[in-house]
């Protein structure tokens, strides 16, 4: 799961108007009896940034220790620092658990820079803010790590939800969320709505913020607005969709769809930016470029080297295009769209020495290892993993930042032709899976 | 705060090479590329190159290439600008800067002396 | 690359007067030009990005203006820590490039 821009995780976005959340529409089609309602009890139970990452608190051993968990949609390993590191307030103290049972096996996960390693184990985790339930889940101890931890994320351990085919130190390790499902009455499914705050947070305000909501096991209808679309998981790894058109402002970048999901296009909540193939990277700045072009920005900007700023409250949304995905929808030969405006993908920095002006970064920046959909698409969407059905949700989400000319949208149906030939199948001999 | 720490002098051989160290403190480390601007006694200033810590990207000056090499240790949040083959042209003051809007803050600066 | 020209090394000025230092670049830059400030043996300290914004705590008697080639510092009521040397830079294309400085000096 890819470090470096990944991991290191950041808000998301927008500056003004700041409180505008949409209204809840009425006209919804019902699903199956028990999917879908009030999770009250987990609604809220994320916190953080998207900066930073957002976290969910857990609970490892006997008697419960009390750990925060980075939720991370694009990996599949439940891993906690259990060893004193400088970054850490807190970490997981075997020795002081009566349920901790020892695996004898260790586990190295390199990243392209960085890394973790620590020893497998079993041991009784649960969700405070979750379903209520106990599970015996593999643990990854974090003994030694490097670029891993971020300083003052307030977040100790990862929670990997995607599938075990990218576990490590191989597949035969099942994931947490597996042993969940296997180990109770919990659905097969979690859906997650990330908020992203629209302005920059201190520390102190992170950690007294509400970042979204985990809802495991269904799907909360008080977070989103309009109807949810779903698009197919196309192989159980990564969270693996196809992308069939990129559009800047309605504009076609008339690539071959191949571009898009080359090698891969995935969801993953612990990505802050848009990430996109350089050759896509490449016609997206562009055409954002050219739709913005009433205001000359520095190279660096783009390159998400360079800030820009604006006079507080006067940042010009308006100059800068919304950016529309099409996905492959559930039925053949048709697609949905979803689009994210630039409060989702223009990041709200607070640098103290440019404090009296509104600051952003752009979050959309190249990848060599296909497109991720990370934060800065997740924040304006509900998201529903619906691992039952092979199948991802999107819907709006009721927390997304937007202003009151534009807001993110999920629309659909459209007519797509030819839609499989947009996946990139990866040659066999590709073992690289996590070193990235 | 943030605050940029370098070492306030290097005399170094020519020929040999030298590592030149700044550790940033008071703000998350990997949010901001790191620059490095060269300096000679009575002259103007030189941009060198920029590294981003979150993934060790660099962007060079051409006049640059080959000569400074950049690297970050993220686990003690300081960047580093190795200058090899040096010659008394190479004698300046070495400063490292944080980006944000163009260069907010800067280091106090390495004076780098070449001298056999 | 983009050249910055400051076409006056060393500008002469007294205490209290109204000074202005100026930078051109080679091309059009937009409004992506900072300003330093630097006291001989000391690092530059930022004092104005985005051609016009003044960087958090810098004296409002420091006023940026201009766009596209040409750009001047202003100092209004200049005082005698102001007597050191300026710098303009351009951050919109790389190589980053800067002016080679102007000098304040009493009349």
């Known amino acids: 799961t890819q470090h470096g821009i990944r991991l290191p995780l950041r808000s998301g976005l927008g500056g003004a108007p700041l409180g505008l959340r949409l209204p809840r529409e009425t006209d919804e089609e019902p699903e199956e009896p028990g999917r879908r309602g009030s999770f009250v009890e987990m609604v809220d139970n994320l916190r953080g940034k998207s900066g930073q990452g957002y976290y969910v608190e857990m609970t490892v051993g006997s008697p419960p220790q009390t750990l925060n968990i980075l939720v991370d949609t694009g990996s599949s390993n439940f891993a906690v620092g259990a060893a004193p590191h400088p970054f850490l307030h807190r970490y997981y103290q075997r020795q002081l658990s009566s349920t901790y049972r020892d695996l004898r096996k260790g586990v190295y996960v390199p990243y392209t820079q960085g890394k973790w390693e620590g020893e497998l184990g079993t041991d009784l985790v649960s969700i405070p803010h979750g379903p209520n339930v106990t599970v015996r889940a593999n643990i990854a101890a974090i003994t030694e790590s490097d670029k891993f931890f971020i300083n003052g994320s307030n977040w100790e351990g990862i929670l990997g939800l995607a599938y075990a085919e990218i576990a490590r130190p191989d597949d035969s390790l099942e994931p947490f969320f597996d042993s969940l499902v296997k180990q109770t009455h919990v659905p097969n499914l979690f859906s997650l709505q990330l908020c992203g705050a629209g302005f920059p947070l201190n520390q102190s305000e992170v950690l007294a913020s509400v970042g979204g909501s985990m809802i495991i096991g269904g799907i909360d209808h008080s977070l989103y607005t309009g109807s949810l679309w779903y698009t197919p998981i196309r192989r159980e790894w990564y969270y693996e969709v196809i992308i069939v058109r990129v559009e800047i402002n309605g504009q076609d970048l008339k690539m071959d769809c191949k571009e898009y999901n080359y090698d891969k296009s995935i969801v993953d909540s612990g990505t802050t930016n848009l990430r996109l193939p350089k050759k896509v990277f490449e016609a997206a700045v562009k055409s954002i470029k050219a739709a913005s072009s009433t205001e000359k920005f520095p190279d660096g900007f783009w390159l998400g080297e360079q800030l820009v700023c604006w006079q507080a409250g006067t940042t010009p949304w308006n100059i800068f295009p919304v950016i529309s995905l099409y996905l492959m929808g559930e039925v053949t030969n048709q697609s949905f769209r979803i689009t994210i405006l630039p409060q989702q993908y223009l990041r709200p920095v607070e640098d103290v020495a440019t404090s009296q002006d509104d600051c952003y970064k752009f979050a959309i920046s190249q990848s060599s290892t296909g497109t991720v959909m990370g934060a800065v698409i997740m924040e304006g969407f509900y998201v529903v993993f619906d691992r039952a059905r092979k199948r991802i949700g999107f819907a709006v989400s009721a927390c997304h930042v937007h202003d009151e000319f534009r807001t993110a949208a999920v629309e659909g149906p459209f007519v797509t032709l030819d839609m499989e030939d947009c996946g990139y199948n990866i040659p066999q001999t590709d073992e690289s899976t996590l070193m990235t | 705060e943030v605050q940029l720490q370098q070492p306030g002098t290097e005399l170094v051989r020519p020929g040999t090479s030298v590592k030149l160290s700044c550790k940033a403190s008071g703000y998350t480390f990997t949010n901001y590329w790191m620059h490095w601007i060269k300096q000679r006694p009575g002259q103007g200033l030189e941009w060198i190159g920029m590294i981003d810590p979150s993934d060790t990207y660099t962007k060079f000056n051409q006049n640059f290439k080959g000569k400074a090499t950049l690297t970050v240790d993220t686990s003690s949040s300081t960047a580093y600008m190795q200058l090899n083959s040096l010659t008394s042209e190479d004698s300046a003051v070495y400063y490292c800067?944080?980006?944000?809007?163009?260069?907010?803050?800067w280091g106090q600066g390495t004076t780098v002396t070449v001298s056999s | 690359d983009i050249l910055m020209t400051q076409s006056q090394k060393f500008m002469s000025t007294s205490v209290g007067d109204r000074v202005s230092v100026t930078c051109k670049a080679s091309q059009n830059v937009g409004r992506n030009v900072a300003w330093y400030q630097q006291i001989s043996g000391q690092s530059p300290k930022p004092l104005i990005y985005s051609a016009s914004h003044r960087y958090s705590g810098v004296p409002d008697r420091f006023t940026g203006s201009g766009s596209g080639t040409d750009f001047t510092l202003t100092i209004s009521n200049v005082q005698s820590e102001d007597l050191v040397e300026f710098f303009c830079q351009q951050y919109n294309s790389y190589p980053y490039t800067f002016g080679g400085g102007t000098k304040l000096e009493i009349k």
């Open positions: 800067a944080r980006s944000g809007v163009a260069f907010p803050y």
